[in-house]
Amino acid sequence: APTSSSTKKTQLQLEHLLLDLQMILNGINNYKNPKLTRMLTFKFYMPKKATELKHLQCLEEELKPLEEVLNLAQSKNFHLRPRDLISNINVIVLELKGSETTFMCEYADETATIVEFLNRWITFCQSIISTLT
């Protein structure tokens, strides 16, 4: 079972992931982003459910498409290159979800825009941070 120190580490990793996702969302929503309309045409798969750490498998599987869309944005909207940003997120996601490789993601029927996708995973981080005991 997780110890209080491992749970604290998990909380900190979730907070880091949350900040990264919020930074991406803020960069995309920046009123100076001329590529926003184009970026909103890309579709992302949404998890059927995302309430637990193992559901991060669904985020991991969408990181490559996310990187591709972010490459469209002007780099000055972000502190890091999309490749480095996604690499950082991937490291956190892998640590959080653990090595349960047999766990397959299931997706909702409806696809989402990048903004809806990011908001979904921001909500996920916030909910786990607030309910993890």
Partner: antibody, heavy 117, light 107 residues
Framework: EVQLVESGGGLVQPGGSLRLSCAAS????????LAWVRQAPGKGLEWVAA???????YSPDTVRGRFTISRDNAKNSLYLQMNSLRAEDTAVYYC???????????WGQGTTVTVSS | DIQMTQSPSSLSASVGDRVTITCKAR??????VAWYQQKPGKAPKSLIY???FRYSGVPSRFSGSGSGTDFTLTISSLQPEDFATYYC?????????FGGGTKVEIK
Amino acid sequence: EVQLVESGGGLVQPGGSLRLSCAASGFTFSSYTLAWVRQAPGKGLEWVAAIDSSSYTYSPDTVRGRFTISRDNAKNSLYLQMNSLRAEDTAVYYCARDSNWDALDYWGQGTTVTVSS
Amino acid sequence: DIQMTQSPSSLSASVGDRVTITCKAREKLWSAVAWYQQKPGKAPKSLIYSASFRYSGVPSRFSGSGSGTDFTLTISSLQPEDFATYYCQQYYTYPYTFGGGTKVEIK
């Protein structure tokens, strides 16, 4: 056949403690998230706590710090340790299995907890 | 927390009637909504998951629909054993939240 059987309910004084148990059978217990849901007399359903397959635990503000959910995979059992009980904790407590990608699919019959002096 | 507003809180209907219960969420849930049936003194029974999929053994007269923020449970032809209280629930995010319930009574 999936079965969930709760036990441990009873009458307890305010400030007291109680430990509920849920014995599970008919599925691979260790692979599932399990939850406790309660229902106060004449009221609706309220999610109380959940524990996932990695034993991470989740609960709402209303019970955090007072209620602790745990599991024993070797015994196929789920527990809810309830401390500092209040009159508003009086309810039927149900154990439920949470499917990996969908909702609470199986429920126990419930055990009644009454907090009264 | 995501509030689930269920309506009506109660309704009276006759055997054979078509009954519709609605649930409105405060934010978009995609299809992460379930419906449960509960009879007095009994545990809830799972009816619908992912907004529109029936659990095994649930009669076809029960159907769910909706996505986003608005969801509906329909009983196409009410049977005597369907008189009960029905609850919607979101499992989009923790903490899970339930609607207030709809009590279906005999007219």
